[in-house]
């Protein structure tokens, strides 16, 4: 069964900066990658970044890089200055539309104990939703 | 509502150059992709030219070099410059936008009218 | 560039007839592909994409099937409304690419 992982960790030297990094243990290729805040994408979260393996990246304030690490993984660095910036407690989802297995979501936020510049290991995440 | 409206059409000689803007109204301008797409008269539909939200542009080889597209967030407009005209892009230009990327354009204008003729 | 064949070019069909219209990519683009419908003079209007999920508002006799490099525009009951030209885009890569359409006709 496809799985998705998410890890979340705040740079130790901007304490307000956040990396989400999200990966996709599946078969299948992937076709579309969202992440958002605040919830699951179209269940009150907030779209960050849209990433599509040919016509490239897209990404929105407070986001300022995504990229993919790896066919099946990416990574988003947000910034963490002004009202929109991301607080220890926010939820990061993301979803992966695999071709042709469909789609799954994850959801992760920084670890309660975490130190700056520390994180979790990147352990899959619960699966929320498998559409 | 969502709303886009073109203007600057007209007849221009070949050779000539043309502005082509859309006013946009109704949802977040800076967040989405635009489009430009034509249609000659009796033809089918032409991507022309798209702008994302950072500003990249991207053209079909028919119009590269020739048209160039951009956009004023502050002002929720967007623009085709099309220059060294020909015939074969007499057409009606419909500004799109492509409000849930990457899934193609969702909200479309009237269009306006080129006519390149000598 | 990805090539879009659209077939039929044209049909004609009588009201509560079914209706399907094919799209052919020139290459693999999973699911990344919309339908659209335009009236003459008016400016076309979104009834699917990716390549199944029907548009806001759109009436449910409209269905889009298929993956990689075919597709299908299905309208299970034509109705009055529905007689007008049909485009199918691609919107997996640039440069983005339309079919060359199908004008569905009163028999």
């Known amino acids: 069964t496809p799985e998705v992982w998410v890890q979340v960790r705040m740079e130790a030297t901007e304490l307000s900066s956040f990396t989400i990094r999200c990966g996709f243990l599946g078969s299948g290729s992937i076709s579309l990658v969202t992440v958002s805040w605040g919830g699951p994408n179209g269940a009150g979260g907030t779209t960050l970044a849209v990433l599509h393996p040919e016509r490239g990246i897209r990404q929105w304030a407070p986001a300022r890089q995504a990229r993919w690490e790896t066919q099946s993984s990416i990574s988003l660095i947000l910034e963490g200055s002004g009202a929109s910036s991301p607080c220890a407690n926010t939820t990061f989802c993301c979803k992966f539309a695999s071709f042709p297995e469909g789609s799954w979501e994850a959801c992760g936020s920084l670890p309660p104990s975490s130190d700056p510049g520390l994180s979790a290991p990147p352990t899959p995440a619960p699966i929320l939703r498998a559409d | 509502e969502v709303q886009l409206v073109e203007s600057g059409g007209g007849l221009v000689q070949p050779g000539g150059s043309l502005r082509l803007s859309c006013a946009a109204s109704g949802f977040t301008f800076s967040r989405d992709d635009m489009h430009w797409v034509r249609q000659a008269t009796g033809k089918g539909l032409e991507w022309v030219a798209a702008i994302d939200n950072a500003g990249d542009t991207y053209y079909p080889g028919s119009v590269k070099g020739r048209f160039t597209i951009s956009r004023e967030n502050a002002k929720n407009s967007l623009y085709l410059q099309m220059n060294s005209l020909r015939a074969g892009d007499t057409a009606v230009y419909y500004c799109?936008?492509?409000?849930?990327?990457?899934?193609?354009?969702?909200?479309w204008g009237q269009g306006t009218t080129v006519t390149v003729s000598s | 560039d990805i090539q879009m064949t659209q077939s039929p070019s044209s049909l004609s069909a009588s009201v509560g007839d079914r209706v399907t219209i094919t799209c052919r990519a020139s290459q693999g683009i999973r699911n990344d592909l919309g339908w659209y419908q335009q009236k003459p003079g008016k400016a076309p209007k979104r009834l699917i994409y990716?390549?199944?999920t029907l548009q806001s508002g759109v009436s449910s006799r409209f269905s889009g099937s298929g993956s990689g490099t075919e597709f299908t525009l299905t309208i299970s009951s034509l109705q009055p409304e529905d007689f007008a030209t049909y485009y199918c885009?691609?919107?997996?890569?640039?440069?983005?690419?339309f079919g060359g359409g199908t004008k569905v006709e009163i028999k």
């Open positions: 990716a390549a199944s």
């Open positions: 799109a936008r492509e409000g849930q990327w990457p899934y193609g354009m969702d909200v």
């Open positions: 885009l691609q919107h997996n890569s640039y440069p983005l690419t």
